[in-house]
Amino acid sequence: VPRWRQQWSGPGTTKRFPETVLARCVKYTEIHPEMRHVDCQSVWDAFKGAFISKHPCNITEEDYQPLMKLGTQTVPCNKILLWSRIKDLAHQFTQVQRDMFTLEDTLLGYLADDLTWCGEFNTSKINYQSCPDWRKDCSNNPVSVFWKTVSRRFAEAACDVVHVMLNGSRSKIFDKNSTFGSVEVHNLQPEKVQTLEAWVIHGGREDSRDLCQDPTIKELESIISKRNIQFSCKNIYRPDKFLQCVKNPEDSSCTSEI
């Protein structure tokens, strides 16, 4: 008789989740010499230990502490790029501008990027059928708590000028409920971070509006400046040209506004 299983509203654990995490870990540590000391089997065991046999609506940041410890990594604190609702362009940018880092350019971010996972209370099984949805089921689910934990630590590590890429095509360019708006903004340390520079990425080719005037950007500005951090905003009118100019800064067309 099949055992009753909790039906959650979100998609289940990504297929071949353990193998994917392990393979990503091996690949990352091969590419990044500073992380070669990492034992990927221990990383997987710590990752698994954070959610296996636990109720998937009752996960805490403490559950991830062993994994955080194993994945401790130093990135240049003044080369951090945060993003909100525009992950692909942010990743394309750091692939070209190799001295800048998104969270997904770190080991822990790389391991979990685009994956879903959850377990079941009192069983060692991984749930491949469904996992809790943040809105419909619960916020303290394994995936949300993981990203909240790593995002908080990433923001806390930042210093000097921190950049954030924001999607100018969204109705809320800055969304207080996004990971950036709810976690990272509040965990930038004013003692270390002097300036947050927002890059607002335009979607339409003919869009010449100053999206730095958007009410949600002014809301971000207010939150940031009240925390003793300066705020700078720049429109990126042509993201394609922007990337091209990052690749070839000497190009004569790259002196004009992008």
């Epitope: 000097d160 004013p190 003692e191 270390k192 002097q194 300036t195 520079e197 100053d210 730095c212 005037q213 002014k218 500005e221 207010s222 940031i224 400046s225 003793n228 300066q230 705020f231 700078s232 905003c233």
Partner: antibody, heavy 119, light 107 residues
């Protein structure tokens, strides 16, 4: 290019009021904060107030009760209303642009306008 | 308010000399320090922000260093056009306050 031009200075009696203007060009007040800084004759610099691009203001508490900063975005002009003036308010008053959107350092300054409070 | 002190209050040096000015805050200002140059009868000019970042167009002979409460401004090789008064400014907390200035002259 960025330019700031102050006006409205002059000789005024103690207890009277004066309104200084700062006409900005080469940038928009919708994009940058503008500060007032003063310098008494032969003395150092003293930060007075700032008006941010959204219209909110911060003041040096020493001036908050007597001075008011405001702006007219359509004229791209910032104002400093100074009431109940005292002899010790005699100074050159500079307006200056925030280096970045909400910046606390000042990258462009006007030439200053001299305010003399004397009976 | 955060008090800023500068030393020396004035100094005289020869062309080509290395000149150092110090600025001390009454509390930790976490590198939120700017340096300005003011020539006689002129408005101040921003040289350095964030304790160490040289503004665009400012000659590389100017530099800034320091952390916590203590900061230093250096001119590696003094030029005649550097005659001016130099001010530090903290931008950690409002009211943003300036040092009293250091008047630099050529011997």
């Amino acid at each position: 290019q960025v330019q700031l031009v102050e006006s409205g200075g002059g000789v005024v009696q103690p207890g009277r009021s004066l309104r200084l203007s700062c006409a900005a060009s080469g940038f928009s007040l919708l994009s940058y904060g503008v500060h007032w800084v003063r310098q008494a004759p032969g003395k150092g610099l003293e930060w007075v107030a700032v008006i941010w691009r959204g219209g909110s203001a911060d003041y040096n508490a020493a001036f908050m009760s007597r001075f008011t900063i405001s702006k007219d975005n359509s004229k791209n002009t910032v104002y400093l209303q100074m009431n109940s003036l005292r002899a010790e308010d005699t100074a050159v008053y500079y307006c200056a642009k925030s280096m970045i959107t909400t910046g606390f350092t000042l990258d462009y300054w006007g030439q200053g306008t001299l305010v003399t409070v004397s009976s | 308010d955060i008090q800023m002190t500068q030393s020396p209050s004035s100094l005289s040096a020869s062309v080509g000399d290395r000149v150092t000015i110090t600025c001390k805050a009454s509390e930790d200002i976490y590198n939120r320090l700017a340096w300005y140059q003011q020539k006689p009868g002129k408005a101040p000019k921003l040289l350095i922000s964030g304790a160490t970042s040289l503004e665009t167009g400012v000659p590389s002979r100017f530099s800034g260093s320091g952390s916590g409460k203590d900061y230093t401004f250096t001119i590696s090789s003094l030029q005649p056009e550097d005659v001016a008064t130099y001010y530090c400014q903290q931008f950690w907390n409002t009211p943003w306050t300036f040092g009293p200035g250091t008047k630099l002259e050529i011997k």
